[in-house]
Structures are given as structure tokens and as C-alpha cells.
């Protein structure tokens, strides 16, 4: 079995997480790809996904998450802008390949978002916080509702405008026009 590895990112509120997930070009270029959060004891939850089939270099924005699939480079770029403390958590990229299980891309991302000064060695304590604002999105994202054909206990969110639950670790504000459709039966 392949060892699950993760890379840790420590960022401050207002900053941007900007990461890449490499994939095999020939196999997965046009496959639909997704960005998921993994919470303890739960199945991974899809936060954003590319179109199906995935379009080359076409940004898909869901709230503060921007996905760009560079087919010619064999990488999915994920940006989470204007980070909030609640965004802290473990994330992963996956490739949907129904009816098979989603294919996970290495490595996982351990995101730690801190308020103000992090006090960690090597960080700059005097930096001004970036409060970059992004325009609201109009992108429609057709994400599979379930991350696994065996995951049938999760009910769809009541509102497409809020994909977070009251006790969730991530709060996706300004999420508009997300269409969630189950692709696994």
C-alpha cells in the first residue's frame, strides 16, 4: 500500500493557499477532479470540483476556492483565498472515475490558519494581513454528491448557498450556483 503523506502549510488569516496536485497526463487529463476536506471519522467531503469533462485551464470558482486544471502540465491547481481560521484541516485532491472509487492524488495538505501573529520560527511577525477580496462567483460546479458508492448516509445540504454545517471546520461564504448531483448509484 502507498503510504499516505501530507505537507503542512501554516498561513495567516487573509492569505492564500496555493497548491498543486500532479496526475498522470495520459490517464486523467479530462477526468473530473475535486478538492476535498477530510474530517476525523468522516468520509471526505467535496468542496469544489472541475467540470465534467474537465476543461483545460478553465478556472472554476466555488466561494473562496479556485480550481484550475492544466491538462498540458498534468496538474490541478488549487487556491483557497482569504483564508479563515475555520479553514484549518486536512485536504486532498481526488479524480472521479465512476463507477470506480475516486483516485486520490498525493500529497495531502494539512492547512493551519492562524489569526494575527503565528509566532512560529521563520515567520515574519510584522507583516500586514492581506485582506484581498475576490468577486462573487457565477461558476456552476457539478460535483458528485457522494465521495464513494458506499457512502449513502449523507443527506444533501438543504441550501445550495451554504455547504457548511453549524459545526463544520470550513465556512464557504458566497457559494452560489452550486449544482450537486449524485453520480454514483
Amino acid at each position: 500500500a502507498t503510504k499516505l503523506t501530507e505537507e503542512k502549510y501554516e498561513l495567516k488569516e487573509g492569505q492564500t493557499l496555493d497548491v498543486k496536485c500532479d496526475y498522470t497526463l495520459e490517464k486523467f487529463a479530462s477526468s473530473q477532479k475535486a478538492w476535498q476536506i477530510i474530517r476525523d471519522g468522516e468520509m471526505p467531503k467535496t468542496l469544489a470540483c472541475t467540470e465534467r469533462p474537465s476543461k483545460n485551464s478553465h478556472p472554476v470558482q466555488v466561494g473562496r476556492i479556485i480550481l484550475e486544471d492544466y491538462h498540458d502540465h498534468g496538474l490541478l491547481r488549487v487556491r483557497m483565498v482569504n483564508l479563515q481560521v475555520e479553514d484549518s484541516g486536512l485536504y486532498q485532491c481526488v479524480i472521479y472515475q465512476p463507477p470506480k472509487e475516486p483516485h486520490m492524488l498525493f500529497d495531502r495538505i494539512r492547512l493551519v490558519v492562524t489569526k494575527g501573529f503565528s509566532g512560529t520560527p521563520g515567520s515574519n511577525e510584522n507583516s500586514t494581513q492581506n485582506v484581498y477580496k475576490i468577486p462573487p462567483t457565477t461558476t456552476k460546479a457539478l460535483c458528485p454528491l457522494y465521495t464513494s458508492p458506499r457512502t449513502v448516509t449523507q443527506a444533501p445540504p438543504k441550501s445550495t448557498a451554504d455547504v457548511s454545517t453549524p459545526d463544520s471546520e470550513i465556512n464557504l461564504t458566497n457559494v452560489t450556483d452550486i449544482i450537486r448531483v449524485p453520480v454514483f448509484n
Epitope: 492564500t16 497548491v19 498543486k20 479556485i66 487556491r79 507583516s127 492581506n130 477580496k133
Partner: antibody
Framework: QVQLVQSGAEVKKPGASVKVSCKAS????????IHWVRQAPGQGLEWMGW????????NYAQKFQGRVTMTRDTSISTAYMELSRLRSDDTAVYYC??????????????WGQGTLVTVSS | SYELTQPPSVSVSPGQTASITCSGD??????VSWYQLKPGQSPVLVIY???KRPSGIPERFSGSKSGNTATLTISGTQAMDEADYYC????????FGGGTKLTVL
């Protein structure tokens, strides 16, 4: 510790090709992108492209498309940058550099010592 | 194509604070890195992820970002800080700013 060691200086004639090598050590070669950056005399840093050693895939800056080829030999943890149809304005110091992390494209934390390529008739 | 704009030169007296700016479209959505380049040497990463210092970089180097402008600040500038400084970001491709020559008077 991570090290990138480049091949020695080259003198080439216009129209010729040059192939610069970059031998990596101290880490898993396949895990991190290798970038090539050059600096011409009196000019700034110019990104030429990246190589994904795992897949062998490369991404080139538009300016160098069709003239540059980036390859690797994983058995000896070495990346190569070949620039063809050389012109006098290709005279520069060429650097290889490695990504800081597997999951990012920038920044470049580790750099080779540089290879001076002189194009002169 | 994506461009990052830096002032060509900045002058500062020893012990004073030097500030070098870098601006670009949607830079607020991108992480900025800064490199120091001295003649005859390889570039050195001095700031990454907008404001983090790699180990071994003196505390007088700091980075910040406001909107679409990133700033490299060198507090208590020393003669040894005289060099060219480049900002960098990743758009579709990797982009360097034009560079700023820092002169310590």
C-alpha cells in the same frame, strides 16, 4: 543536504545547441519539480520552464517554446536543459532550481551554482 | 502575459529601512516569493508565502502584502544587503519581477 550541481561553462556558435545538466542529491529526485532560470548580462531573472521528473512532462515559457527541451534521467537523478538555435542574446548564466515542496510550484528554495553559456561567433 | 512590476532601484542609508514593492494583477490571490541575487552568486530565497523567512535568513528581512501589492522590507539595512531583489509569483507560468537594485549608500 539538498544539492544541485550543474555542468561547466560552455562556449557555442550561433545556430548551435547547448545541453546543460543538473545533478540532484540529498532528496527523492522524482518528488519535486526542477525549474530552469537564466540571467543574461545586465538583465533580470527569466524563468524558462519546469520539468516534472516523475512524469517527464515539461512546461516551457512561451518565449522558449520550440527551442528548449527539458528532460531527465531518473537513474542518475539528473535533469537536462537543451537550448537550440542559439543566438548571441542567449549568452547568460543558466540555473536549475528545485521547488520548496512537492505540492507547490514556487518558491525555489534550492539552486544550482549556475552554468555560463556564451554564444559567440 | 502576466507581469510583476518592481521599481528599478532603491537607495537606503545603512541602518535605515528599505522597502521594495512588487505589483501585479490579482497578486492578492497568489503567493509571493522574494529572492536576493548578488553578482557571481546563485539566487537566495529570502521570503516565501508572502511573509515567511526560510531558516538562515536574518530577521531584518520581512514581507507583507496588501491587495495586489507585495512589499519586501529590510530593517536596519546593512552593506551586505546590497544586491538585486526579485519578486516571483505563479500565474499560469512562473513569473519574476524585473528586479530592483538595492544600493546601500
Amino acid at each position: 543536504q539538498v544539492q544541485l550541481v550543474q555542468s561547466g561553462a560552455e562556449v557555442k556558435k550561433p545556430g548551435a545547441s547547448v545541453k546543460v545538466s543538473c545533478k540532484a542529491s540529498g532528496y527523492t529526485f522524482n518528488g519535486y519539480y526542477i525549474h530552469w532560470v537564466r540571467q543574461a548580462p545586465g538583465q533580470g531573472l527569466e524563468w524558462m520552464g519546469w520539468l516534472n521528473p516523475n512524469s517527464g512532462g515539461a512546461n516551457y515559457a512561451q518565449k522558449f517554446q520550440g527551442r528548449v527541451t527539458m528532460t531527465r534521467d531518473t537513474s542518475i537523478s539528473t535533469a537536462y536543459m537543451e537550448l537550440s538555435r542559439l543566438r548571441s542574446d542567449d549568452t547568460a548564466v543558466y540555473y536549475c532550481a528545485r521547488d520548496q515542496r512537492k505540492t507547490t510550484v514556487t518558491p525555489f528554495e534550492y539552486w544550482g551554482q549556475g552554468t555560463l553559456v556564451t554564444v559567440s561567433s | 502575459s502576466y507581469e510583476l512590476t518592481q521599481p528599478p532601484s532603491v537607495s537606503v542609508s545603512p541602518g535605515q529601512t528599505a522597502s521594495i514593492t512588487c505589483s501585479g494583477d490579482k497578486l492578492g490571490e497568489r503567493q509571493v516569493s522574494w529572492y536576493q541575487l548578488k553578482p557571481g552568486q546563485s539566487p537566495v530565497l529570502v521570503i516565501y508565502q508572502d511573509n515567511k523567512r526560510p531558516s538562515g535568513i536574518p530577521e531584518r528581512f520581512s514581507g507583507s502584502k496588501s491587495g495586489n501589492t507585495a512589499t519586501l522590507t529590510i530593517s536596519g539595512t546593512q552593506a551586505m544587503d546590497e544586491a538585486d531583489y526579485y519578486c516571483q509569483a505563479w500565474d499560469r507560468n512562473v513569473v519574476f519581477g524585473g528586479g530592483t537594485k538595492l544600493t546601500v549608500l
